[in-house]
């Protein structure tokens, strides 16, 4: 939602967290700003303090409950407001009617581990974190592998169009250090976006056996 010269973007992690970023042209003086969440059909409301992340943008996380609790559903609408202190009052700087399951961004996958590694192949698994049971199997993944001498941006993306929490990387070079990352996205939601990339998993392929043709 855009009000005046500000932009206010929020995502729901599908369980108990709404993360928001508010950017404002022309930095405010030292003032305190918050995000307030008011669901249309629930007894609770929640607030978080916006903290600067750059010259003109602030971020905060609305913690709605225990990490794995299902605090919102597809029918919920949450009024989100950015409020900034002016004098003793609060001023509404931005406002949006937020549909959580239209604005999803899951947590980065966790627990990456090498299941099996060979000279040219590596099987890696991971887990999804704090993802709603509502998705059932309606998730997709993207993965990338960092090869020596390259950057993450240069790494080709591997797409897994189903809920598959493992991958078998092929055509790797023996005795070589690699890094691997994965991210997840629900198929649901008009404004849904990819999760952050997972923490990189470092692994090394096995050296080619001496005297053998590889």
């Amino acid at each position: 939602a855009v009000n005046g010269t500000s932009q206010f973007t929020c995502f729901y992690n599908s369980r108990a967290n709404i993360s928001c970023v508010w950017s404002q042209d022309g930095a405010l003086q030292d003032t305190s700003c918050q995000v307030h969440a008011w669901p249309d059909r629930r007894r609770w409301n929640q607030t978080c303090e916006l903290l600067p992340v750059s010259q003109a943008s602030w971020a905060c996380n609305l913690i709605l409950g225990a990490p794995d609790s299902q605090k919102l559903t597809t029918v919920d609408i949450v009024t989100l407001r950015v409020l900034c202190r002016e004098g003793v009052r609060w001023r509404v700087m931005a406002i949006q009617d937020f549909k959580p399951f239209e604005n999803l961004r899951l947590m980065a996958p966790i627990s990456l581990q090498v299941v099996h590694v060979e000279t040219h192949r590596c099987n890696i698994s991971w887990e999804i974190s704090q993802a709603s049971h509502y998705f059932e199997r309606h998730l997709e993944f993207e993965a990338r592998t960092l090869s020596p001498g390259h950057t993450w941006e240069e790494a080709p993306l591997l797409t897994l169009k189903q809920k598959q929490e493992w991958i078998c990387l092929e055509t790797l070079t023996p005795d070589t250090q690699y890094e691997f990352q994965v991210r997840v996205k629900p198929l649901q939601g008009e404004f849904t976006t990819w999760s952050p990339w997972s923490q990189p998993l470092a692994f090394r392929t096995k050296p080619a056996a001496l005297g053998k043709d590889t």
Epitope: N3, G4, E86, W90, R91
Partner: antibody
Framework: EVQLVQSGAEVKKPGASVKVSCKAS????????ISWVRQATGQGLEWMGE????????YYNEMFKGRVTMTRDTSISTAYMELSSLRSEDTAVYYC??????????????WGQGTTVTVSS | DVVMTQSPLSLPVTLGQPASISCRSS???????????LEWYQQRPGQSPRLLIY???NRFSGVPDRFSGSGSGTDFTLKISRVEAEDVGVYYC?????????FGGGTKVEIK
């Protein structure tokens, strides 16, 4: 019905202090801000500052800083405005007015009847 | 501080005729949230001020529809479509966009 009832007229000598009260009724006192506005005889309106009774937080117009103190007593739903080091130019009608804690629409919606303060030697 | 300048100082009007009051701010009073917090207050003789219009053109509850507000940026107008006897008094514009909030000097509406 929202009502703000202010204390009676005061006559003060230069250099003295005056404390004006504003008793609120008809709404939850701690949910709204109380602003103070003054009107010198035959003059316009001047916003002095305000207090949020919910936490006692105050904001004063720079013009009055150091001389004005706003307080509240939530047990009797009353706000106070004290002005010190009075001078003749402080002769005015002092109003309290209610305002929303979140400034969505307007600054002040209901006003007290005003308290006349005369500063004279 | 934002200076609010009203004109005219005095406005003699005939009952049933329209009246128009101008208010000019010394700087743009569009708040950084995109709203313009320009308000109009009426003060009848011997009474406290009363809110008429907020955010330039919105009538406060109970305010007759003969009162209307308009304008943007730095120039604002309060119009009374047909003046009635009870409209006599002083009208103040007020800006709530930039602290300290400030009032105009007032316009006195009287019957000819």
């Amino acid at each position: 019905e929202v009502q703000l009832v202010q204390s009676g007229a005061e006559v003060k000598k230069p250099g003295a202090s005056v404390k004006v009260s504003c008793k609120a009724s008809g709404y939850t006192f701690t949910d709204y801000v109380i602003s103070w506005v003054r009107q010198a005889t035959g003059q316009g309106l001047e916003w002095m500052g305000e207090i949020y009774p919910g936490d006692g937080n105050t904001y004063y117009n720079e013009m009055f800083k150091g001389r004005v103190t706003m307080t509240r007593d939530t047990s009797i739903s009353t706000a106070y405005m004290e002005l010190s080091s009075l001078r003749s130019e402080d002769t005015a009608v002092y109003y309290c007015a209610r305002g929303s804690y979140t400034y969505d629409n307007y600054a002040m919606d209901f006003w007290g009847q005003g308290t006349t303060v005369t500063v004279s030697s | 501080d934002v200076v609010m300048t009203q004109s005219p100082l005095s406005l003699p009007v005939t009952l049933g005729q329209p009246a128009s009051i101008s208010c000019r701010s010394s700087q743009n009073i569009v708040h950084s949230n995109g709203n313009t917090y320009l308000e109009w207050y009426q003060q009848r003789p011997g009474q406290s001020p009363r809110l008429l219009i907020y955010k330039v053109s919105n009538r406060f509850s109970g305010v007759p529809d003969r009162f209307s507000g308009s304008g943007s940026g730095t120039d604002f107008t309060l119009k009374i479509s047909r003046v009635e006897a009870e409209d006599v008094g002083v009208y103040y514009c007020f800006q709530g966009s930039h602290i300290p909030w400030t009032f105009g000097g007032g316009t006195k509406v009287e019957i000819k």
